[in-house]
């Protein structure tokens, strides 16, 4: 039994997968912030989690996926105001009773120390200092991401 949040997440991911391949992104678009091999867009309006997910999709991006603790810290270092919360692409899967990223993978329990309950209609937000479980209907800001395409160095023969 999938929750409405899970269905929304799956639908958006599937529609993203159906879109035609685009040329790789070599530089971050204006207004996007480069963080290593990603471009991040921090919203300045608020939305519930599923609307945030949809908004990122319209920008040909996704809600932020965080690979590990190191990436979390680097992302949090960009957040200036301690009081502001941002949705990321992680929510509670009722059917699998686990935290699930919007790309279908499950949270490695060592990656994020989540404050709050793991239960139905819970989604994950980050602040400058912490990671929180919030009701997915809560209206807060969000972070979209685009992956940068790695540029392979060309090797030229000696001239």
């Amino acid at each position: 039994q999938k929750s409405s949040i899970e269905k929304c997440s799956v639908d958006i991911q599937q529609s993203r997968n159906k879109t035609t391949e685009r040329p790789g992104l070599l530089n971050c678009p204006i207004y996007w912030q480069q963080l290593r091999e990603k471009c991040l867009l921090f919203s300045h309006t608020v939305n519930p989690w599923n609307n945030s997910l949809a908004d990122c999709s319209t920008k040909e991006s996704s809600l932020l996926l965080i690979r590990d603790k190191d990436e979390l810290i680097h992302t949090q270092n960009l957040i200036r105001d301690k009081a502001i919360l941002f949705w990321i692409g992680l929510n509670f899967s009722l059917s699998e009773k686990n935290w699930k990223w919007i790309n279908g993978s499950f949270l490695n329990s060592n990656d994020l120390e989540i404050r709050g309950d793991a239960k139905e209609n819970s989604c994950i937000s980050i602040s400058q200092t912490s990671v929180y479980s919030e009701y997915c209907s809560t209206e807060i800001r969000w972070i979209c991401q685009k992956e940068l395409t790695p540029v392979r160095n060309k090797v030229y023969p000696d001239s």
Partner: antibody
């Protein structure tokens, strides 16, 4: 509604640092992109750069080595510093709110009224 | 950087006439990323049009914007005395943000 007001010295000596502040009233600085633009007398507009409310910046490459834009959320203002100025930096300096990318690109609105900075010894 | 070229440099018309101002980009600009501003002597620019064709709040409907790719147009359907000013286009689709050199609209 949101209003912006530039302040700072109107005269700066060559090789010194130009410092201006833009005070935001009628709204919070903790959203949007906050921009500086300048206009030399009788010439066109030149974008200097912006700071986002989270503190990240983007500068015009032609000025990048000399410019710093900073933000003070507690005072609801943002600032411009331009180092090693010359006569070519004489201009009216404007601050403006940039709607950035929130689904639509909103453009620069509103603007401050502008302040003339003359670089001369 | 994207260079915006506005034409004509000066446009001389009478009140009641139609004004057509052009802005040409050196490379393609998404229509979402083009704006027009009006500037009167001694004043800050005022946003007229964003997203190439959307009127900003409080802008009369005699102002309209159109275009895509590299060619954009600002049209003022019937000139009022207060419309005589300098008009600037601006692109904000790629960094650095750039402005055109301006078109001066003067009374004939």
């Amino acid at each position: 509604q949101v209003q912006l007001q530039e302040s700072g010295p109107g005269l700066v000596k060559p090789s010194e640092t130009l410092s201006l502040t833009c005070t935001v009233s009628g709204g919070s600085i903790s959203s949007n992109y906050w921009t500086w633009i300048r206009q030399p007398p009788g010439k066109g507009l030149e974008w200097i750069g912006y700071i986002y409310y989270i503190g990240t910046t983007n500068y015009n490459p032609s000025l990048k080595s000399r410019v710093t834009i900073s933000l003070d959320t507690s005072k609801n203002h943002f600032s411009l510093r331009l180092s090693s100025v010359t006569a070519a930096d004489t201009a009216v300096y404007y601050c403006a709110r940039d709607g950035g990318y929130s689904g639509t690109y909103w453009g620069l609105d509103p603007w401050g009224q502008g302040t003339l900075v003359t670089v001369s010894s | 950087e994207i260079v915006l070229t506005q034409s004509p440099g000066t446009l001389s018309l009478s009140p009641g006439e139609r004004a057509t101002l052009s802005c040409r980009a050196s490379q393609s600009v998404s229509s979402s990323h083009l704006a027009w501003y009006q500037q009167k002597p001694g004043q800050a620019p005022r946003l007229l049009i964003y997203g190439a064709s959307s009127r900003a709040t409080g802008i009369p409907d005699r102002f309209s914007g159109s275009g895509s790719g590299t060619d954009f147009t600002l049209t003022i359907s019937r000139l009022e005395p207060e419309d005589f000013a300098v008009y600037n286009c601006q692109q904000y689709g790629s960094s650095p943000i750039t402005f055109g050199q301006g078109t001066r609209l003067e009374i004939k």
